[in-house]
Amino acid sequence: VPRWRQQWSGPGTTKRFPETVLARCVKYTEIHPEMRHVDCQSVWDAFKGAFISKHPCNITEEDYQPLMKLGTQTVPCNKILLWSRIKDLAHQFTQVQRDMFTLEDTLLGYLADDLTWCGEFNTSKINYQSCPDWRKDCSNNPVSVFWKTVSRRFAEAACDVVHVMLNGSRSKIFDKNSTFGSVEVHNLQPEKVQTLEAWVIHGGREDSRDLCQDPTIKELESIISKRNIQFSCKNIYRPDKFLQCVKNPEDSSCTSEI
């Protein structure tokens, strides 16, 4: 008789999840020699230990502490790029601007990027059928708690000028409910962070509006200012040209506004 299994509203664990996490860990240490001290088997064991045999609606940041400890990494605190709802462009940017880092350029972010995972209470099985949805089921699920934990730590580490890339094509350019709006903004340390600089990325070719005047950006400015951090905002009218100019800053067309 098949055992009754909890049906959640979200997609199940990504196929080949254990293999993918382990492979990503080894790949990361291969391309980042400064992280060669990391024991990837221990990293996987700590990752697994955070959610296996636990109720997938009852995960805490504490569950991820062994993993956080193993994945401790120093990134230049003044070279942090946050993003909201525009991940691909942020990653294209750090691929070119090698001295800047998104969360997914760190070991822990790289391990979990685009993956879903959850277990079941009292069994060592990984649930490949379904996992809790943040809205429909519960917020304290393994994936959400992981990203909340690593995002908080990443924001806490930031210093000097912190950049954030925002999607100007969204109805809410700044969304208080995004990870950036609900976690990262509130964990920037005013004693370390001088300025948050927002880059609002335009979607339309002919869009020449000043999206820095958008009400949600004003809301972000207000939140940041209340935290004694300065705020600045730039429109990126042509993201394609922006990337090209990061690659070739000496190009003559790169002096005009992008």
């Epitope: 492979a23 080894v26 020699p33 691929q95």
Partner: antibody, heavy 120, light 107 residues
Amino acid sequence: QMQLVQSGAEVKKTGSSVKVSCKASGYTFTDYIMHWVRQAPGQALEWMGWIDPEYGRTDYAQKFQDRVTITRDRSMSTAYMELSSLRSEDTAMYYCARSAHTTGFGFAYWGQGTLVTVSS
Amino acid sequence: DIQMTQSPSTLSASVGDRVTITCRASEDIYSNLAWYQQKPGKAPKLLIYDANSLADGVPSRFSGSGSGTEFTLTISSLQPDDFATYYCQQYNNYPYTFGQGTKLEIK
């Protein structure tokens, strides 16, 4: 079994470009970094760069930075190395290679090599 | 870039001999070193990784030692199949770099 199969030999004119392919089989393509190494006739091996096939992220040796582009097609489990502005010194055997994850970061697996001849 | 210097560049030896090839790194590479064997017209073959670990399927007459900046590859008793060119490679830092090679020929 694990195999890296490269495209055939190429003869190119000075100033042109060449694109060499490396088709992977027998393993999950996205699980391993792919490297490119070249060897001019009678010379030592020279590392050119790597690609993470999962994300397409790359890194190149400074020497090749302006002329090399490594790409991949995940659906075809194939990596590509394109070298532009060819000169006679680029005449070499070009190899794709990867580690085994169990053998440190030495290259345990190699393609058979693609001979690129650059003539004026 | 880290320079890898191999010596000798050519080595003449006979079947049954014990031979040693040396590789020196221009800076500390810990144990992040590999040794390869290459025969004419063929791709290199990994022999040793992490300075002293034998790769799968490699005969036990091959051994590696050293750490830091000085490394050696030893073949305890040369076999006819061992006449080839040998390369060391550091993978401590990018760009990965190779030694210039040691050609092992029959005396």
